[in-house]
């Protein structure tokens, strides 16, 4: 055993190159200087080391940097990153977006591993907030990232970051998350003109209040039914038949197919049947003529 710890004559590594793939594990341990490895980490990726050999290289780096690797090494880890444990990564201080991208690239096509989850957490915490470039990067690799954040976490996302969000990034967001994201999107896109604004804001409308829907109804936006069906029920209920007709434009005919689904079903129940009949769609379930509608929620608010 003692003999194996000494590097055989003439085998001392002068640089990290392909000759090392022929080294046994104990030879790598004995003949490769950790400091040399650290300065030439960028070469490791180009060399077809076995998993066992990579374990040895990792062990050497761990011994050299017991408190955690410096970013200059982390950025060039390449496939060695897949050998890291969440505990290893918690020791790192990753501040460069280029480092984050390099490591996410290694994991590309794989599922979100505990290692990647830990890396992202460390990076975002280090940055202090989820800026646009970071969000852009994270959603490019993991489209569901944004919808994994709690409403509390989303509240710290600056409105400028919303420009990085694509419709597919919001696919699994729930109403509580959209309630937080919508005002940020409204602020981010406020200087756009009508039609461009609607294209950008459309994916966030699940968090829009009634007054914003009323405003949109005055802008000939022709909202499609899929978007309408994702609106908050409490935001849709106060809309008049005329406002819904203006909001949907030619898509208003689609209400018939959705009359048994929320929010259309609940909205129909709040409208006068006379008003619904003006649409000519055969929508049924409105308030019959001659009935008095009491808004009990308003009464409670006043008392």
């Amino acid at each position: 055993e003692v003999e194996k710890t000494a590097c055989p004559s003439g085998k001392k590594a002068r640089e990290i190159d392909e000759s090392l793939i022929f080294y046994k594990k104990w030879e790598l341990e004995a003949c490769v200087d950790a400091a040399l490895l650290a300065t030439q980490m960028d070469r490791v990726n180009a060399i077809p080391f076995t998993y066992e050999q990579l374990d040895v290289l990792k062990h050497k780096l761990d011994e050299l940097y017991p408190q955690g690797y410096p970013e200059s090494v982390i950025q060039h880890l390449g496939y060695l990153f897949l050998k890291m444990s969440p505990e290893d990564i918690r020791k790192w201080n990753v501040t460069s977006l280029e480092t984050l991208k390099a490591l996410l690239e290694v994991n590309k096509g794989h599922e979100m591993s505990p290692q990647v989850a830990t890396l992202i957490d460390r990076f975002v915490k280090g940055r202090g907030q989820l800026d646009k470039d970071t969000l852009d990067t994270l959603t490019a690799f993991y489209p569901g990232y944004l919808c994994s954040l709690s409403p509390e976490e989303l509240s710290s996302v600056p409105p400028s970051s919303i420009w990085a969000v694509r419709p597919q990034d919001l696919d699994t967001c729930d109403p509580r998350q959209l309630d937080v994201l919508y005002p940020k999107a409204r602020l981010a896109f406020q200087n756009m003109n009508g039609s461009e604004y609607f294209v950008k804001i459309q994916s966030f409308l699940g968090g829009a209040p009634t007054e914003d829907l009323k405003a949109l109804s005055q802008q000939n936006v022709s909202m499609d039914l899929a978007t309408f069906m994702k609106l908050r029920t409490d935001a849709v209920l106060p809309l008049t038949v005329a406002e819904v007709q203006k909001l949907l434009g030619p898509h208003v005919e689609g209400l018939k197919a959705e009359e048994r689904h929320r929010p259309v079903r609940d909205w129909i129940l709040r409208q006068r049947q006379d008003d619904l009949d003006t649409l000519g769609l055969g929508l049924q379930g409105g308030i019959p003529n001659g009935y008095l509608v009491l808004d009990l929620s308003m009464q409670e608010a006043l008392s």
């Epitope: 569901g144 709690s150 509390e152 976490e153």
Partner: nanobody
């Protein structure tokens, strides 16, 4: 693509309970949270509950106080404990995490 498998659905009487599970494949971390959605016959898909990345939770008003979402990171699994089940809870329940969806598990509540 992340693989999610739901289980635990079945037939239960109104007022009864069920516990749904959603397990992620391989080494995937459930530390990024998950959500349960459901689709009742002839209806649109609707959100039920979420456990977010930071461990906090959220519920649709229709299930608040009756359903509880939780996760076990060691088992890469998210659970939905459903108590005081009602007829209107009948639906196919789907789990989603990081934009991936499971195949769903049927929950039927009978009178």
């Amino acid at each position: 693509q992340l693989q999610l498998v739901e289980s635990g659905g079945g037939l239960v009487q109104a007022g009864g309970s069920l516990r749904l599970s959603c397990t992620a494949s391989g080494s995937t971390s459930m530390s990024y949270g998950a959500k349960w959605f459901r689709r009742a016959p002839g209806k649109e898909r609707e959100w039920v509950a979420s456990v977010y990345r930071d461990g906090t939770t959220g519920y649709d008003d229709s299930v608040k106080g009756r359903f509880t979402i939780s996760r076990d990171l060691a088992k890469n699994t998210v659970y939905l404990q459903m108590n005081s089940l009602r007829l209107e809870d009948t639906a196919v329940y789907y789990c989603t995490a990081l934009n991936s969806w499971g195949q769903g598990t049927q929950v039927t509540v009978s009178s």
